[in-house]
């Protein structure tokens, strides 16, 4: 970077620049550590070194130099629990949104060499330490293979995985995407004895196939199993497998609750209790009935014994179970009880506490707000996050629930830390909750700090983003409001990101930025600089960002609002929120746009067809344009079935095509990757294609063999300059 | 007590088929792989095939493959042994044995297979 | 596949003298997957070893099993007249699972 040129002091600062957004200049850093212990973590330094420490004795060394690390080109590493050996992750190669695959190799901390003899194969697609000593499960070409040490031969566990076909211990697209939200699907049980895991069949699921143009004379065609809406989904069956002598008994399958096996199911997660007991969750394929399952291995029969009276059912009566996933639960130290979030009897989200059934659970957190995650239960703690503190939706507290005590006395351990700076947080918990990181996003500058797990008191600051702040203090940021408007008897959380010199007697155009998918939240206290900062600060332009009816964490009646009729009020709420600013008397009328990518593609693609005329123009990336072309998971959670006794009639009225009439008035840009996996791009081509029969005139941008993320640098210069172009153009101002 | 018991040997022309059985008891037979093994007279032991408790995934050596089929029938706690095509060399003592790929812990007394014209 | 190979094919030894078998994999095998077994003529094998050095239920603590990776070792302290029989030891490791060829045990 050339060096600044000296200025004297007075109004010096500048505004955002797209090439500050492009260049990624205002990005923070945040410190997780990787904790191996009650008291000790690693952590890869700024030059990759990989570093031990130790919080008591306040030692620190170099555990694996970043010589080594280079001697491989690892990117990620792995301790294996007896401290005997690292896995070095290199070759990393992005499948889908959690999925990669990678090459791994061993290094010996003893010896201070690599494992040579049996390594591994290549490319893994997933590797992983058990979680006492150091054996290896690994996943190659769908099958599991186990090594009892890292210079043993391997054992192979399975032996009916097929590309595209059977998965073994890695989900297929759907499970990551929309159920699991990982790249694995296998489980150690915490003594490393068993190892348990899914397969997924998907032999009979059809393939959603698309070009992938490369460099080539001729396209790769991309095949995937997609089971779009009311599609034939994977067929799954969890197994588990003695990992001392796997070859003896092989791998035992776990019986699937009978109310949940006499139709189609999913399995939605698995915990493992104690060394002995693991409990697994399942699902209706009409999402509102979940099964939470305590199974046992009983020694006199080698088997895994799943009780009727050890059956948990969760129902939903006015949507779907769960919030954007089925809560897992979070075990009691006696193996038996644990912590869960589910609604309470208002439709708020809290945390319950199970003893024998559901029916019978205490219920420990209430308010008209909601718990969102248990992070650690100890023997006499429980830490969770909500968004209670103040009655501000978009915020996160880490709350301390002493459950020693009678009543449970309940304590926020973040609320007034920072509070101007962090009012959104997350932790990291070492082993039993003797220390704990709090990683703060916002709203000011994030900061990554440690504490004490019995006390709170603060002990180090890990991360505080000291060269942002600097680099921050010559550039005119734009001021960011979080409020509330009423519109009848409904509240709507919007964040409003206004210029530098905002006056509020001068007219400003405005830009709404939209998501609202369901259970998903835009407003919240996080820091960040990105498209919409730059827009604000240079060019002048007023941000929204509204949570409309069916996002999260506002109870079920605002959250189930739009079940089975997706695309109606998430819509309304846009509109409605619109009107109001415009109310406020700063918005130019005639210089209104919406943008939004994916879920927002399909609402700003809606807002823009309701015929209100409140819109000039505006962006839909990555669009959903129809519920029967997206995933089956995801689209019958909230729609049901579209077949014509279900929910066939709103699946084809809630279409972006159906409205293809209604774009004549407004600007459109339509932009799409060529390789989306997710939402493919046939969304896209079916809005164009109606567009077309409509005669209405529309621009649209390809991002070829782009996937859903148009991540790639060139495109994502390529992507935000055209977009900047089609709005300063819309809104009249001046290159 | 474990018991395994096998039934179902002969004598067969070369191309037949037989069917043998091994009647389980004293275990969860649903919860165990099982195996079948061979000895050739006065030979050694080979692994032939193996199937995993629930049924759903089977196992060959590459000498039987293709001819033979391994199948169970957990409500009768039985494990079945289809042989095709039968040839002078499948001529053993067959073994039923409880486990995957070993340690084989438990074993029938076995039945013999005898292919001949 | 993974071939074992077992030595002696034959060891003449008399009653309360010690035995020592061996038993070499072609390729290495991680001693959780290996077994050894006892058979008398007319009778079933009977397992005595799992996990290379795991004596079974009920089998005598005569029997003694060692070794990894290639080199295994079935050793019988001192030998009884009942132990007199073909011994085999078997890999688990790989499909197809193997069994060596036999060491017979017989009396001198």
């Known amino acids: 970077r050339p060096s600044r040129v000296y200025k004297p002091e007075g109004n010096t600062k500048r505004a955002l620049t797209l090439k500050d957004i492009l260049n990624g200049t205002f990005s923070y850093k945040t410190y997780f550590p990787n904790w191996i212990s009650e008291q000790e973590y690693l952590h890869q330094s700024e030059d990759d070194n990989i570093v031990f420490y130790n919080i008591e004795t306040r030692e620190s060394y170099i555990i694996l130099s970043n010589s080594t690390m280079k001697s491989v080109n690892a990117t990620d590493y792995g301790l294996s629990p007896d401290r005997q050996f690292v896995y070095l992750e290199s070759d990393y190669s992005k499948l889908w949104r959690y999925s990669y695959t990678a090459t791994y190799y061993i290094y010996d901390l003893q010896n201070g060499e690599f494992v040579r003899g049996y390594e591994l194969p290549r490319p893994i697609q997933y590797l992983c330490w058990s979680p006492v000593g150091s054996k290896l499960a690994y996943v190659y070409q769908n099958n599991i293979y186990l090594k009892q040490r890292p210079g043993d031969p391997p054992f192979q566990i399975t032996y009916t995985g097929r590309e595209n076909r059977i998965f073994n211990g890695i989900p297929d697209w759907v499970y990551e995407e929309e159920m699991l939200a990982t790249k694995y699907a296998l489980w150690w049980s915490p003594d490393g004895k068993f190892l348990a895991y899914v397969e997924f069949n998907d032999s009979d699921i059809p393939i959603i196939a698309y070009s992938y143009y490369g460099d080539g004379q001729y396209p790769r065609t991309i095949n995937i199993p997609y089971p779009k809406a009311g599609a034939k989904n994977p067929v799954v069956r969890v197994f588990i497998v003695d990992t001392t002598y796997p070859h003896h008994v092989g791998p035992m399958e776990v019986p699937v609750p009978e109310m949940i096996a006499s139709s189609d199911y999913y399995f939605s997660w698995l915990t493992w209790v104690s060394s002995e007991r693991v409990c697994l969750q399942w699902l209706k394929r009409v999402q509102n009935v979940s099964v939470l399952s305590i199974c046992d291995f009983r020694e006199d029969w080698h088997a895994w014994e799943c009780p009727k009276n050890q059956e948990h059912v969760e129902e939903s009566r006015t949507g779907w179970a769960g919030g954007f996933f089925v809560s897992t639960p979070a075990f009691s130290q006696d193996a038996t009880s644990y912590y869960k979030i589910f609604s309470d009897k208002d439709g708020y989200k809290h945390i319950h506490y199970i003893k024998d059934t559901v029916e019978n659970a205490i219920q420990i957190t209430s308010g008209k707000w909601e718990a969102i995650y248990i992070f650690r239960v100890t023997q006499d703690s429980l830490f969770y996050s909500s968004n209670e503190f103040e009655g501000y939706p978009g915020r996160r507290n880490i709350y301390r629930i002493s459950i020693g005590n009678s009543p449970p006395s309940k304590k926020c351990v973040t609320c007034h830390l920072r509070k101007e700076r962090c009012q959104y947080y997350t932790a990291s918990f070492s082993y039993k909750a003797k220390y704990y990181a709090l990683v703060c996003y916002g709203p000011g500058l994030p900061i990554s700090t440690l504490h004490d797990g019995r006390t709170d008191q603060e002990i180090q600051v890990l991360e505080e983003n000291k060269e942002l702040e600097n680099s921050l203090r010559n550039i005119q940021l734009p001021k960011v409001e979080i409020k509330k408007l009423k519109d009848g008897g409904l509240t709507f959380w919007y964040k409003m990101i206004l210029p530098p010199q905002f006056d509020r007697s001068k007219k400003y155009p405005l830009l709404i930025q939209v998501y609202g998918g369901p259970c998903s939240q835009s407003v919240k206290s996080v820091f960040a600089v990105n498209w919409i900062t730059y827009l604000a600060s240079k060019e002048g332009i007023v941000i929204a960002l509204v949570d409309g009816r069916g996002t999260a964490f506002q109870g079920d009646k605002f959250l189930h609002a739009v079940y089975r009729k997706l695309g109606v009020y998430e819509v309304e709420d846009q509109l409605t929120a619109v009107r109001k600013f415009i109310e406020m008397g700063f918005i130019d009328e005639e210089r209104i746009a919406i943008w939004g990518w994916s879920y927002g593609g399909y609402v700003s693609s809606l807002a823009l067809a309701s015929g209100t005329g409140l819109f000039k123009c505006g962006i839909a990336v990555a669009p959903v344009s129809s519920w029967e072309y997206y995933a089956s998971i995801y689209s019958e959670r909230f729609m049901g079935l579209p077949t014509k006794d279900d929910n066939l009639e709103h699946y084809k009225n809630s279409t972006v095509m159906a409205r293809a009439e209604y774009f004549r008035n407004v600007d459109y840009l339509l932009i799409h990757g060529t390789a989306d996996d997710n939402v493919h791009f046939q969304n896209s081509a079916q809005i164009a294609k109606a567009l077309v029969n409509a005669q209405v005139d529309f621009q649209a941008m390809w991002y070829s063999d782009q996937n859903h993320g148009i991540l790639s640098g060139r495109s994502q210069n390529h992507l935000y300059t055209h977009m900047t172009h089609f709005l300063k153009q819309c809104f009249s101002l001046s290159d | 007590e474990v018991q395994l018991l096998e039934s179902g040997g002969g004598l067969v022309q070369p191309g037949g088929s037989l069917r043998l059985s091994c009647a389980a008891s004293?275990?969860?037979?649903?919860?165990?792989?099982m195996s079948w093994v061979r000895q050739a007279p006065g030979k050694g032991l080979e692994w032939v095939s193996a199937?995993?408790?629930?049924?759903?995934?089977?196992y060959y050596a590459d000498s039987v493959k293709g001819r033979f089929t391994i199948s169970r029938d957990n409500s009768k706690n039985t494990l079945y042994l289809q042989m095709n095509s039968l040839r002078a060399e499948d001529t053993a003592v067959y073994y039923c044995?409880?486990?995957?790929?070993?340690?084989?812990?438990?074993w029938g007394q076995g039945t013999l297979v005898t292919v001949s014209s | 596949e993974i071939v074992l190979t077992q030595s002696p094919g034959t060891l003449s030894l008399s009653p309360g003298e010690r035995a020592t078998l061996s038993c070499r994999a072609s390729?290495?095998?991680?001693?959780?997957?290996l077994a050894w077994y006892q058979q008398k003529p007319g009778q079933a094998p009977r397992l005595l070893i799992y996990g290379a050095s795991s004596r079974a239920t009920g089998i005598p603590d005569r029997f003694s099993g060692s070794g990894s990776g290639t080199d295994f070792t079935l050793t019988i302290s001192r030998l009884e007249p009942e132990d007199f029989a073909v011994y085999y030891c078997?890999?688990?490791?790989?499909?197809?699972?193997?069994f060596g060829q036999g060491t017979k045990v017989e009396i001198k």
């Open positions: 078997q890999q688990g490791l790989n499909i197809p699972s193997t």
């Open positions: 199937i995993s408790g629930s049924g759903g995934s089977t």
């Open positions: 044995a409880k486990g995957w790929l070993g340690p084989f812990d438990y």
């Open positions: 004293g275990f969860t037979f649903s919860s165990y792989a």
């Open positions: 390729q290495s095998v991680s001693s959780s997957y």
